[in-house]
Amino acid sequence: VPRWRQQWSGPGTTKRFPETVLARCVKYTEIHPEMRHVDCQSVWDAFKGAFISKHPCNITEEDYQPLMKLGTQTVPCNKILLWSRIKDLAHQFTQVQRDMFTLEDTLLGYLADDLTWCGEFNTSKINYQSCPDWRKDCSNNPVSVFWKTVSRRFAEAACDVVHVMLNGSRSKIFDKNSTFGSVEVHNLQPEKVQTLEAWVIHGGREDSRDLCQDPTIKELESIISKRNIQFSCKNIYRPDKFLQCVKNPEDSSCTSEI
């Protein structure tokens, strides 16, 4: 008799999820000498324990604590780059500017980037058919709670000047409902963080507007100022040139505004 299985609105667990997590862990620990002590099999054990056999709408940050403990990592607190709705460019940037880090440049972020996962209550099975959608089903699902947990910890660790890359092509350049807007902004520590510097990335080639004057950016500035953190904002009019100049800062064309 086939077992009844909950049908969720979101896509199911990424195929070969355990193998992918394990393989990423092995790769990461090989590349990053400071994480060589990590036992990837134990990391997977902690990961599986966070969501398997649990109702996928009833996951808590507490469920992820064993994984957080195993994945504890020190990144330079003054070299943190947050991002919202512009992940690819943020990652391209930290691949060039190797001393800066996005969340996905840390072990835990790297393990889970672009993956989906969930289990089923009271069975030791992974659900490859469907997983809860944040909007249509529930917010306390394994993926959302994971990112909320690691994002909070990442923001809490930041110090000095924190940078955030924002997508100037979106109607809400700063979105209060994004992970950045709902988690990271509120977990920057005013006693450690002096300034949040926003980089607004322009999409159109001929777009010369000052997007730092956008109402949503003003809203971000207000939230940050109320938290006793200074705010600054820069327009990145030419993201392609911006990346090129990060690679080759001596290039003569890199003295002008990008």
């Epitope: 355990p18 193998e19 394990l22 036992d39 099999q41 599986k48 056999s53 009271n122 099975k125 992974i126």
Partner: antibody, heavy 120, light 107 residues
Framework: QVQLVQSGAEVKKPGSSVKVSCKAS????????FSWVRQAPGQGLEWMGR????????NSAQKFQGRVTITADKSTSTAYMELSSLRSEDTAVYYC?????????????WGQGTLVTVSS | DIQMTQSPSSLSASVGDRVTITCRAS??????LAWYQQKPEKAPKSLIY???SLQSGVPSRFSGSGSGTDFTLTISSLQPEDFATYYC?????????FGQGTKVEIK
């Protein structure tokens, strides 16, 4: 039918090393992990370590770290356990056992066991 | 390391008896628990996984229950072939650890 066939009994001198093999057949070798579990005469079961052939990674119990090397050869579908600096307390039956890579289930198949006797 | 403690260490029972073996973990292991049966000079055989799921081909007189730290293996009606040693094992974290075993003998 899945089978794990282990190498034969060994008699070793204290201070020497032993390497036990476990050949898997009847399943996709790279889809599984292989653990080594030992049992001293009249005693219980003791987990030593585990290898994931697909990824080429292994871990082991702290008690054996520095003395045990667990490897796998995908081309021959064989897992190996090498134990060095043997002492009399290492006299035991050594079993290999299979579980899924994700470690969501038990050791579902076991080898027949290999008796290793350490004696001067 | 997680310690697994089984009780009793041995018991005598008759064919047809209901037998219960308990296993306690030194810390919570959710349902990551397996039970094995071992007969003399043989390799262990998997009976139960995920605390209560019956391994394929295992008779339904075997059942498991529990979660967290306290677990039970029950044989509802002991058969002659069930006289053996039973081990619990956690697979919540490394190192994997086994209980010390419970020997079920003929009364």
């Amino acid at each position: 039918q899945v089978q794990l066939v282990q190498s034969g009994a060994e008699v070793k001198k204290p201070g020497s090393s032993v390497k036990v093999s476990c050949k898997a057949s009847g399943g996709t070798f790279s889809s599984y992990a292989f653990s080594w579990v030992r049992q001293a005469p009249g005693q219980g079961l003791e987990w030593m370590g585990r290898v994931i052939p697909q990824l080429g990674i292994a871990n082991s119990a702290q008690k054996f770290q520095g003395r045990v090397t667990i490897t796998a050869d995908k081309s021959t579908s064989t897992a190996y356990m090498e134990l060095s600096s043997l002492r009399s307390e290492d006299t035991a039956v050594y079993y290999c056992a299979r579980d899924d890579i994700a470690a969501l289930g038990p050791f579902d198949y076991w080898g027949q066991g290999t008796l290793v006797t350490v004696s001067s | 390391d997680i310690q697994m403690t089984q009780s009793p260490s041995s018991l005598s029972a008759s064919v047809g008896d209901r037998v219960t073996i308990t296993c306690r973990a030194s810390q919570g292991i959710s349902s990551w628990l397996a039970w094995y049966q071992q007969k003399p000079e043989k390799a262990p055989k998997s009976l139960i996984y995920a605390a209560s799921s019956l391994q394929s081909g295992v008779p339904s007189r075997f059942s498991g229950s529990g979660s967290g730290t306290d677990f039970t293996l029950t044989i509802s009606s002991l058969q002659p072939e069930d006289f053996a040693t039973y081990y619990c094992q956690q697979y919540n974290s490394y190192p994997r650890t086994f209980g010390q075993g419970t020997k079920v003998e003929i009364k």
